[in-house]
């Protein structure tokens, strides 16, 4: 192999290793892949064709500021997808349409700072969606009932400052149980926001400037769910 | 199979009220697969679209910036319907107006009703 | 996705193939659906989500969608295929239906 990834057990290392394109000398069976530290501007999906195997793919800390759909046709396996800390700014319907097994995106440190549209609405086996240190000014991702299973939505250091509920009631048929909305400057909990999401678990407000009159009606508004 | 009737009046004064029903049959107003909306065709012009309704925990409604002071979109789910009332209307609204069922996920039009053409004038 | 521009008009002879554009910013970032229109009838969904045919849509109708275009494709095309075609897509920022100014397609 001329690439200078380490690889065992099907897994991949090809981190920290200053590469600027997806290795194509690696064994055709694995099933991780981890390119996290490199020099990585895009992700050619036919560079991904050989390791069609893939369960897990990890990216981070990289270059990237578009993703080709056509990404997760290659992948059909892909159930964990790590994006963190690169420089997507649009996430469009197509972005993950193919990506219908995940059930780990994690988004976080990117520069999203509005989800329009339905980007997650084929993502029916997620389970974490990681979001935070985003731009995202609320809390809305999407247009219609979607993210059935989804059990952990992590927005913290976001631009959020109210929770309303037509944002959160996409989660109706969902099973929310973790809502980590830490260090954003929330001043506005509307009425009936946490209807959709009443099985919460945990509600992390770290570094949350609340203060008596919105924590008053925070309670309140978690005793009506 | 989906089926979208269109009832209401074909003629209509300017400065009053447009009122169209639309009956569904085949599927539900209330699902959560589909949202529901207006659309009309001026005589020789294109499709322009007027606005849908559609239900997550509670009803929404998203109107085309050009009609949005006077247009209302509502469910009836006892009669399993939609209607669509169009204020202060003017001759420029004479069209012919189509109900429709916008599919998830992505909002194709996958089902019309048969239209009713609106005439506007004294 | 707040406008897209189709031809008024495109002619073709029978048989031949025809294909009718939809331009807009960035448009296949968008899934773009197509609709046919006969004179006095309702549009009929003809192409979805880029290139997907709903069921009793002839083979002959495909659809394509990348980079700032979107096109319609009618192979073989026949005289009842003779009709409007528009183009559509939504975003939920602006409007749920946008719509093209639609395209007349002659069979000569």
């Known amino acids: 192999s001329t690439t200078k990834c380490t690889v065992s057990h099907e897994v991949a290392d090809c981190s920290h290793l200053k590469l600027t394109q997806v290795p194509d000398d690696l064994p055709t069976n694995i099933t991780v892949l981890n390119l996290t530290h490199n020099q990585l501007r895009r992700l050619p999906a036919a560079n991904f064709t050989r390791y069609s195997q893939l369960t897990s793919l990890d990216v981070g800390f990289n270059t990237i500021s578009k993703l080709e759909p056509e990404l997760c046709q290659k992948l059909p396996m892909l159930k964990v997808l790590n994006l963190q800390h690169n420089e997507l700014s649009q996430l469009s319907d197509k972005t993950f349409a193919f990506c219908t097994n995940l059930t780990e995106l994690h988004l976080m440190s990117n520069s999203i700072q509005k989800i329009k549209n339905n980007p997650f609405v084929k993502q029916k086996n997620l389970i974490t969606l990681d979001l935070s240190h985003n731009g995202l000014s609320s809390t809305k991702l999407g247009t219609q009932v979607q993210l059935e299973n989804l059990q952990e939505l992590l927005l913290s250091n976001n631009k959020i400052q109210a929770l309303k509920s037509e944002e959160l009631d996409i989660f109706a048929n969902s099973s929310l149980k973790k809502l980590e909305l830490s260090s954003n400057q929330i001043k506005e909990f509307s009425p009936g926001c946490f209807h959709a999401i009443g099985r919460l678990f945990g509600l992390f407000l770290n570094n949350v400037q609340l203060g008596p009159s919105l924590t008053e009606k925070l309670c309140l508004e978690l005793a009506n769910t | 199979q989906v089926q979208l009737q269109q009832s209401g009046p074909g003629l209509v004064k300017p400065s009053q009220t447009l009122s169209l029903t639309c009956a569904i049959s085949g599927d539900s107003v209330s699902s959560n697969s589909a949202a529901w909306g207006w659309i009309r065709q001026s005589p020789g012009r294109g499709l322009e679209w007027l606005g849908i309704?559609?239900?997550?925990?509670?009803?929404?409604?998203d109107y085309a910036l050009s009609v949005k002071s006077r247009i209302t979109i509502n469910p009836d789910t006892s009669k399993n319907q939609f209607s669509l009332q169009l204020n202060s209307v003017t001759p420029e609204d004479t069209a012919v107006y189509y109900c429709?069922?916008?599919?998830?996920?992505?909002?194709?039009?996958?089902?019309w009703g048969q239209g009713t053409l609106v005439t506007v004038s004294s | 996705q707040s406008v897209l521009t189709q031809p008024p008009s495109v002619s073709v002879a029978p048989g031949q193939t025809a294909r009718i554009s939809c331009s807009g910013d960035?448009?296949?970032?968008?899934?773009v659906h197509w609709y046919q229109q006969k004179p006095g009838q309702a549009p009929v969904l003809v192409i979805y989500?880029?290139?997907e045919r709903p069921s009793g849509i002839p083979e002959r109708f495909s659809g394509s969608n990348s980079g700032n275009t979107a096109t319609l494709t009618i192979s073989g095309t026949q005289a009842e295929d003779e009709a409007d075609y528009y183009c559509q897509s939504y975003d939920s920022q602006f409007s749920f239906g946008v719509f093209g100014g639609g395209t007349k397609l002659t069979v000569l």
């Open positions: 429709a069922r916008y599919s998830y996920p992505f909002y194709s039009i996958d089902y």
């Open positions: 989500e880029d290139s």
């Open positions: 960035n448009i296949g970032s968008y899934y």
């Open positions: 309704i559609q239900i997550r925990s509670k009803w929404y409604n």
